[in-house]
Each structure stands twice: as C-alpha cells, then as structure tokens.
Amino acid sequence: KFSKQSWGLENEALIVRCPRQGKPSYTVDWYYSQTNKSIPTQERNRVFASGQLLKFLPAAVADSGIYTCIVRSPTFNRTGYANVTIYKKQSDCNVPDYLMYSTVSGSEKNSKIYCPTIDLYNWTAPLEWFKNCQALQGSRYRAHKSFLVIDNVMTEDAGDYTCKFIHNENGANYSVTATRSFTVKDEQGFSLFPVIGAPAQNEIKEVEIGKNANLTCSACFGKGTQFLAAVLWQLNGTKITDFGEPRIQQEEGQNQSFSNGLACLDMVLRIADVKEEDLLLQYDCLALNLHGLRRHTVRLSRKNPIDHHSIYC
C-alpha cells in the first residue's frame, strides 16, 4: 500500500508522488533507499525533491531504484516507498506491458480515455494522442483537458493509446508520454434526463413534532453504468453540510440500484427530533446528470399524534 511502482522513459520527465499522503502543511524528506542519501531540494539538480513530489528532469536509466519518503507532522513520522524504474526508449512501435498503465473500458455513450499521471505535471493543453503509434486525426477524436473523447466508438477503436505532453519546470520543457489500453464494451446503456420517483413534486410530508422523520430522494438516470449522476438534498437552497443543523443529515453514501435495468440512486434525509421551525423549511430533492438537473420540493406539515379520520354523520 505504501510502496508504489512508478516508471518512465529515459530523457523524459518523471514525477513521482510519495505514496504516504499527509496534510499540505507536513514536510516530506526524500532519500535514496540503497544509500540512505538525502535527495536535494534545490531545483538546479536533475533529480530533486519538492514536497510530496520527487522529480526526475529528465530521467536516466541509472535513476532506477527504491526511494524513501518520510512525511513529518509535528508529532508523527510516516514512511512511504517509491519503486522507480526508468527504461530505455524502444526503437520500434510496440509498447511493452511493463510500460502500460491500467486498461480502461469505453462504450458508445462513454469513451473517455484519461492521460495517466498527468495531474502530477505542469502541462498546458493540447495533449497529443496516438493509437498504436499513429497520431490521431479526424473529427471523431477530441482532446479535451486531460482526456481523449472518441465519438461513435466502435470495436475497432480498441487498442493502445499514448498521450504525449510537455512538462514545464522553471522555463525548461520536458517531454512525457504515457500509454494505456482501451477496450470497447458492447453495452446497450443510455442516459436520460433525471426522473425523480420520490418525492412527488410539492409533496406535503406529515411529521410529528419531537419524533424522527426520514425523507427519501430517489431518481433514475437511464440504463447501465452512468458516467455522472447524483442525488442530494438541499434546505432552503443550501447544501445540507452548509446549513449547519446537526439534527438534519443526509444518509452517508448513495446506493446505485438497478431495478428493471434502470440505474437509480437514492439519498435519505434524516431529521432527528423534528422541531416547529423544521416545518418552515423548504426541502429540495435534487437529481442531476450530464443532461441537467431536476428538483422536487417537499414541505413538512404537523401530524396530530392521534390522527383519527373525520366522521361525517
């Protein structure tokens, strides 16, 4: 867990993050494990430490080895290990398995390929993308931020995709490449504008003062795995966490259920010890995905403890 494999190509930039994460204020010391020699922090060095990051600008095959990072808080020191391997550049087109990042899957509706490790680097758009060493051209391919989008994905789009970008450090530019496999799932999924199953729009929920009450926000977003979908509650237009009433909490986590093949989510709002002032609040069940946002509003009304039906003579 706290030993992480990292790899790169000679003469390219490689930046490695300490596998032992800490708060931003903590100091991090880096050592070359074999010699216990401290890694310098001065940026004039080809290999230097910069907080949580260890930078090889550029990397050399001889840099391969295990590096130790010690994260220091005021009272605790915690250790991580980065196992770095730098490979010689291949003369041919094939990318060996040991240089491949994790495989990603796509489908007709969701075909994003993220460029691995790019968040560690200081890069500027656009990314260059290659498939099996060929530069990608044509309107079906769109390089967007740190990912590639392929329109109308077909099974022939499966293959090895390489992203190439430039890392800038103090005015100097270094090339970085990263490759991962892309597989295509034949998935008949689809995404819809959210449909809220509960609560009904402008529903009045009867509650008893002093008792606990639960409100469930339930919505469906289409069929199959959804790329982005969420349900949440708001109080008077404010997020629950920002509202500041500890009696009112959203149930932790969201469970994705597939009833009738539909992808649905629900979020339970728990109100402990219902008070009079809770009846004055507006409770909004929000469901959102890439298509947009739908909102159903609920209000609470007082339920008499003895709720006899009226008897008409």
């Epitope: 867990k1 994460q21 708060k23 808080s73 605790f76 915690r78």
Partner: antibody, heavy 123, light 107 residues
Amino acid sequence: EVQLLESGGGLVQPGGSLRLSCAASGFTFSIYDMIWVRQAPGKGLEWVSTIRGEGGSTYYADSVKGRFTISRDNSKNTLYLQMNSLRAEDTAVYYCARDPWSTEGSFFVLDYWGQGTLVTVSS
Amino acid sequence: EIVLTQSPATLSLSPGERATLSCRASQSVDDDLAWYQQKPGQAPRLLIYDASNRATGIPARFSGSGSGTDFTLTISSLEPEDFAVYYCQQYITAPLTFGQGTKVEIK
C-alpha cells in the same frame, strides 16, 4: 496543551435521545478528523463514528447507523454525537478522540482522547 | 469488517519480565496497526503506530513489529506502571476495529 472534554452523558430510557458534546482546545480543531469511541462496562473499545475535518464526510459503525449522527461546529471547536432510538446495548463510556493525520479517504490512529462520558440506557 | 484477535487474553508476569502480546487480523492491514494501553478509569493511550513506530513520549521498552496479518507488541522489561490492558487497532479501512484486549497483570 491538547484537551478534549466530553459532556452530555446520563441516564436515558430505551428509545430516548441524548446529545453528547466534546469541547476541544489546544489545537486547530477544524483541520483534524474527530472520532467517537465507546466502551461498554468491563468490555473492549468500539469505534462509533468519524467526521472529517471540514465536516463533509461521515462514517458510522453498523451498530449505530441510522440512529446516531456525528457533527461538528468548527467555529465553537466542538464535536457532537446525536444519539436517537437508544438501546440498552448503547450503554457505555463514550470517548471523543482526535485523528492527527488523516487525509480524505484514509484513517489513522487516535492520539488524544477525552476522559469519557457515561451513557446509561435503562428503564 | 476486519476482525482483530488478541492473544493471550491475560498475561501474568512479574516486574522485569518480558511481555509478548499478539494481534492477528482476519485480512491484511499492511502496517496500518496501532497499540494502545488502558489503565482502569482512564482513557486509552497511544503507544505504537504504523505497526512499529513509537508515539511521542513512549519509553523505548515498548516495541511493535509485524506486517500484513500478524503483529506483536513487546515490552522488554515490565515496569510496575505497565500492568494494564493493551488493545490493537487497525485503521486501513472503516469500520475501524479494535482487538478485544490483552490484560497484563502482576503474577
């Protein structure tokens, strides 16, 4: 000096509610994850709940999920545990404790503990 | 959830003797394991974190070892103030869990 002081314990009937507080001092409360741990009389320690420093993510033991709510007021340096639908098996000393390290998605040890407050659920 | 099993339940030793306490996890916790000491009427006190690191102010006679599923707390030479209950705790994932405790008592 780091100090945690629990309050709000007492005798309550089954089905009743209680709200525990933990007043923190001697450290920057808002950046630390906070935890409730309980210990039934003569028994071992049981983790109850964790809340992240910024107050966003919360985690609960299955035994209290849906009945207990952890919250915090960073402006008052105070941690809370709202306990509803109390049962006899909730009888315990409740400790609040600090996690001195955690980053989102991870947990760590408990380096400072309060002295505990006793909650007794009995009719 | 990850179950931690401590053994023995009770350890009867004399001051100056070596104490060896065991904690076994139902699945790997890497080195995300801590040891606490608790005396009657007091809150627990952190002794060891990340399986083998002593917390600030903890005497050198306390040491921890192990990784994965098997862990050991060793007290090299028991002092009178070391007689207490000791708990292990994993923090690799929620729910955080504790062992049931080992009581170290005076023989």
